[in-house]
């Protein structure tokens, strides 16, 4: 389906202002995507952690399609897509459905095809080439090897898209080897490897300033050269910076 | 701190259906837990019944709740329920609800839960 023309007065659902939830919030220009390992190796209950995970890194990204927009994909022997980039939703209503993600607890969860999906199917079409474009890659399973012949294909040619792909690596049967290989690609490509999902909370907020440092800021309105500019004081507005990069709003 | 309380316990007969709920005093903070269920029979240890995840999607259960027992959770209302059918005498014992942090994986660990309610006495005649 083609989007509707918009007009400037068009306002979104997603545009009525909902109040940050965290003292650490990022407004950058981010297109960030969420694939979730749904085999078996993780239990039902880990699974819903990997959700929490989830829903809680959202909480921290100022989510809107001007700032950051968000895809969510639970993957197994194939893809699901619960939200996608495009999706004009409120943010507390993208949670929810983040949170509804299904456990699959299949057999096989291929790293392979999920790569492949973002490349021709998220990424087909780079709309936002102003802003960064992360995946953030949940993996606690090895997919079987005929499955994963063209896995640095799709790595390589998410990297001609600079799509940066960002691995965690959870429990002992993550597959360290395709880890190390999306590493090697870029150096932007950390890898995040964690013991089991109850390494996810502690890892939480290392991850999601990782990912905000590698999007741009907004660059600022241009104004007519006879226009007077107003600034609002940091107190006013209630943001602070956190850092070089990445902004913060105190509650 | 979340504060839980339990209520609807009674004396049913055997063969008969009863509805536990459990509420919690802070919205905010009940979407963020596990709800588990546990019951301790009279000079029994406390034993696992069943847990419903902090989305609501998932479920487990111990092996004598299986078919007979149900668990459910409505956000709005802040309240987890119990819904337990067919009862047998041996399901006669105080039942507690508890909330576990939504990191948290190993929902049947007594010890990794935070809070607990009061417990409510099912007492099933035979």
């Known amino acids: 389906p083609t989007d509707a023309p918009v007009s400037p007065t068009t306002l979104y659902v997603e545009d009525i202002s909902e109040p940050p939830l965290h003292d650490f919030y990022c407004s950058r220009l981010l297109d960030l995507v969420f694939l979730l390992d749904g085999s078996s190796r993780l239990s039902e209950a880990e699974f819903e952690v990997l959700k929490a995970f989830v829903v809680d890194m959202m909480e921290r990204l100022r989510i809107s399609q001007k700032w950051v927009r968000v895809a969510v994909v639970e993957y197994h022997d194939g893809s699901h897509a619960y939200i996608g980039l495009k999706d004009r939703k409120r943010p507390s209503e993208l949670r929810r459905i983040a949170s509804q993600v299904k456990y699959a607890g299949s057999q096989v969860a291929s790293t392979s095809e999920v790569l492949k999906y973002t490349l021709f199917q998220i990424f087909s079409k780079i709309d936002r080439p102003e802003a960064s474009r992360i995946t953030l890659l949940l993996m606690a399973s090895q997919e079987p090897q005929r499955m994963s012949r063209n896995f640095v294909r799709y790595v390589q040619g998410l990297k001609k898209k600079k799509v940066i792909v960002i691995p965690v690596g959870i429990g002992p049967h993550a597959n360290l080897k395709q880890i190390r290989l999306i590493e090697k690609q870029a150096p932007e490509n950390k890898a995040f490897v964690l013991s089991s999902v109850d390494e996810l909370e502690q890892q939480r907020d290392e991850i999601v300033s990782y990912l905000c440092d590698l999007a741009p800021e907004a660059p600022p309105p241009t104004l007519p050269p006879d226009m007077a500019q107003v600034t609002v004081g940091p107190g006013l507005l209630g943001v602070s910076t956190l850092g070089p990069k990445r902004n913060s709003m105190v509650l | 701190a979340v504060q839980l309380v339990d209520s609807g316990g009674g004396l049913v007969q055997a063969g008969g259906s009863l509805r536990l709920s459990c509420t919690a005093s802070e919205r905010t903070t009940f979407s963020s837990y596990t709800l588990g269920w546990f019951r301790q029979a009279p000079g029994k240890e406390r034993e696992f019944v069943g847990g419903i995840s902090w989305s609501g999607v998932s479920t487990d259960y111990a092996e004598f709740a299986k078919g007979r027992f149900t668990i459910s959770r409505d956000h709005a209302a802040n309240t987890v329920y119990l819904e337990m059918n067919s009862l047998k005498p041996e399901d006669t014992a105080v039942y507690y609800c508890?909330?576990?942090?939504?990191?948290?994986?190993?929902?049947?660990?007594?010890?990794?839960?935070?809070?607990w309610g009061q417990g409510t006495q099912v007492t099933v005649s035979s």
């Open positions: 508890a909330a576990l942090g939504r990191y948290r994986s190993n929902w049947r660990n007594i010890g990794q839960y935070d809070y």
